[in-house]
């Protein structure tokens, strides 16, 4: 998957663009909005009818090195009585994000952009029947 | 990717930190195995906390299109298909990394940007706020 060139005709490549070797791009990994904070409702992972746990995956050759993944706690959903209702399904909600991967080849290092799928949380869905043709 | 030679004593000079600026291959590797978008494409409708998806487009960003979830109801859908206001539909938000063209309009020069997206909604029991 290649990053598309700027497609709009009114975008002219400015003179100020840095020179970049063919087949590659320059990437500044000083993150814009680094200190922005998520203001999600408190403890939604425990209060949800499809609760989830978090695990942190850590990889020193990935930037960012820490990625948090959610896992649904139950197969079914939690009903008003606090019991698991298996007529409903807890399913993961996922979102793609970008990371930078550092690869070592002998005494050389290269960098590769990667898309990774992060499980963000879970939601409770009504199952459907598989209609066999 | 683009290979950068390391200094002669490279076995002893391993840099644990990433450099501020790197050259990366234009091809993006996709690690998303064991997933099928068809399966989850209708969760927004089947969820007890359904949501609508809104297109957010920005040609100066990669990916240029990001879909934002907005919960359809304040409450959750009960077994009878009605909205139950004893429960709350709340957005699940996630910080993701995208590429921002920097300087603007440059085809091959980017900076990482952290953005907050609402990915979907989940149904939660409300918290009772106990006033002291």
């Amino acid at each position: 998957r290649k990053i598309p060139k700027v497609g709009h005709t009114f975008f002219q490549k400015p003179e100020s663009c840095p020179p970049v070797p063919g087949g590659s791009m320059k990437l500044d990994i000083g993150i814009i909005n680094e200190n922005q904070r998520v203001s999600m409702s408190r403890n939604i992972e425990s209060r949800s009818t499809s609760p989830w746990n978090y695990t942190v995956t850590w990889d020193p050759n990935r930037y960012p090195s820490e990625v948090v993944q959610a896992q649904c706690r139950n197969l079914g959903c939690i009903n008003a009585q606090g019991k698991e209702d298996i007529s409903m399904n807890s399913v993961p909600i996922q979102q793609e994000t970008l990371v930078v991967r550092r690869k070592h080849q002998g005494c050389s290092v290269s960098f590769q952009l990667e898309k990774v799928l992060v499980t963000v949380g879970c939601t409770c869905v009504t199952p459907v029947i598989h209609h066999v043709q | 990717g683009i290979t950068i030679p390391r200094n002669p004593g490279c076995p002893n000079s391993e840099d644990k930190n990433f450099p501020r600026t790197v050259m990366v291959n234009l091809n993006i590797h996709n690690r998303n195995t064991n997933t099928n978008p068809k399966r989850s494409s209708d969760y927004y409708n089947r969820s007890t906390s359904p949501w609508n998806l809104h297109r957010n487009e920005d040609p100066e960003r990669y990916p240029s299109v990001i879909w934002e979830a907005k919960c359809r109801h304040l409450g959750c859908i009960n077994a009878d298909g009605n909205v139950d206001y004893h429960m709350n539909s709340v957005p699940i938000q996630q910080e993701i990394l995208v590429l921002r063209r920097e300087p603007p309009h440059c085809p091959n020069s980017f900076r990482l940007e952290k953005i907050l997206v609402s990915v979907g909604c989940t149904c939660v029991t409300p918290i009772v706020h106990h006033v002291a």
Partner: antibody, heavy 123, light 108 residues
Framework: EVQLVESGGGLVQPGRSLRLSCAAS????????MHWVRQAPGKGLEWVSG????????GYADSVKGRFTISRDNAKNSLYLQMNSLRAEDTALYYC????????????????WGRGTLVTVSS | EIVLTQSPATLSLSPGERATLSCRAS??????LAWYQQKPGQAPRLLIY???NRATGIPARFSGSGSGTDFTLTISSLEPEDFAVYYC??????????FGGGTKVEIK
């Protein structure tokens, strides 16, 4: 032909292990959640374990939790049940069953069954 | 854990007669009850799901009814191939897929 064929059963001593397999054919395997259901000789049916399409959701009956492990290989159209620390009460005909849920999710009704493989735990 | 009790344990009837099988749950399973048929030496076969929906290829003589705790499987006119053991199964609460003890429909 749409079918499920179980294998791997046999006579085993208490405390030992056995691995059951189920080969699926005639349908898109990873479109379905799958289960193991057992039936002791002359007795009723007992659900043992279930797994969704991508192994992201797995469940076990309390009677086998911690001893049995369900897994699947979608590339091989196969379902497995690793049974450790076997007991005499695990003696049963083990059926592989296909869930009728769409999108590889659970519906907890079983629309297609194999013929079963017999596991006998005895010293 | 939900317990499903089937009655009678054995039902002796002749071909052409009407069979009425009962399944009672220890607590409400709403409408999430299924019925299976099992013939000797064969795997079970799904007949009815969600209390009253016939599975694909199941003849119209099989019908299901009930909700909450009391459910009925009715075979309007028994055919020779209907003599078998019938199991009910719930999909409402954990643990999932709990089955009743079965009702044997035998030839009188």
């Amino acid at each position: 032909e749409v079918q499920l064929v179980e294998s791997g059963g046999g006579l085993v001593q208490p405390g030992r292990s056995l691995r059951l397999s189920c080969a699926a054919s005639g349908f898109t395997f990873d479109d379905y959640a799958m289960h193991w259901v057992r039936q002791a000789p002359g007795k009723g049916l007992e659900w043992v374990s279930g797994i969704n399409w991508n192994s992201g959701g797995i469940g076990y009956a309390d009677s086998v939790k911690g001893r049995f492990t369900i897994s699947r290989d979608n590339a091989k159209n196969s379902l497995y049940l690793q049974m450790n620390s076997l007991r005499a009460e695990d003696t049963a005909l083990y059926y592989c069953a296909r869930d009728m849920g769409g999108f590889g999710e659970f519906y907890w009704n079983f629309g297609l069954w194999g013929r079963g493989t017999l596991v006998t735990v005895s010293s | 854990e939900i317990v499903l009790t089937q009655s009678p344990a054995t039902l002796s009837l002749s071909p052409g007669e009407r069979a009425t099988l009962s399944c009672r749950a220890s607590q409400s399973v709403r409408s999430y009850l299924a019925w299976y048929q099992q013939k000797p030496g064969q795997a079970p076969r799904l007949l009815i799901y969600d209390a009253s929906n016939r599975a694909t290829g199941i003849p119209a003589r099989f019908s299901g009814s009930g909700s909450g705790t009391d459910f009925t499987l009715t075979i309007s006119s028994l055919e020779p191939e209907d003599f078998a053991v019938y199991y009910c199964q719930q999909r409402s609460n954990w643990p999932p897929a709990t089955f009743g003890g079965g009702t044997k429909v035998e030839i009188k």
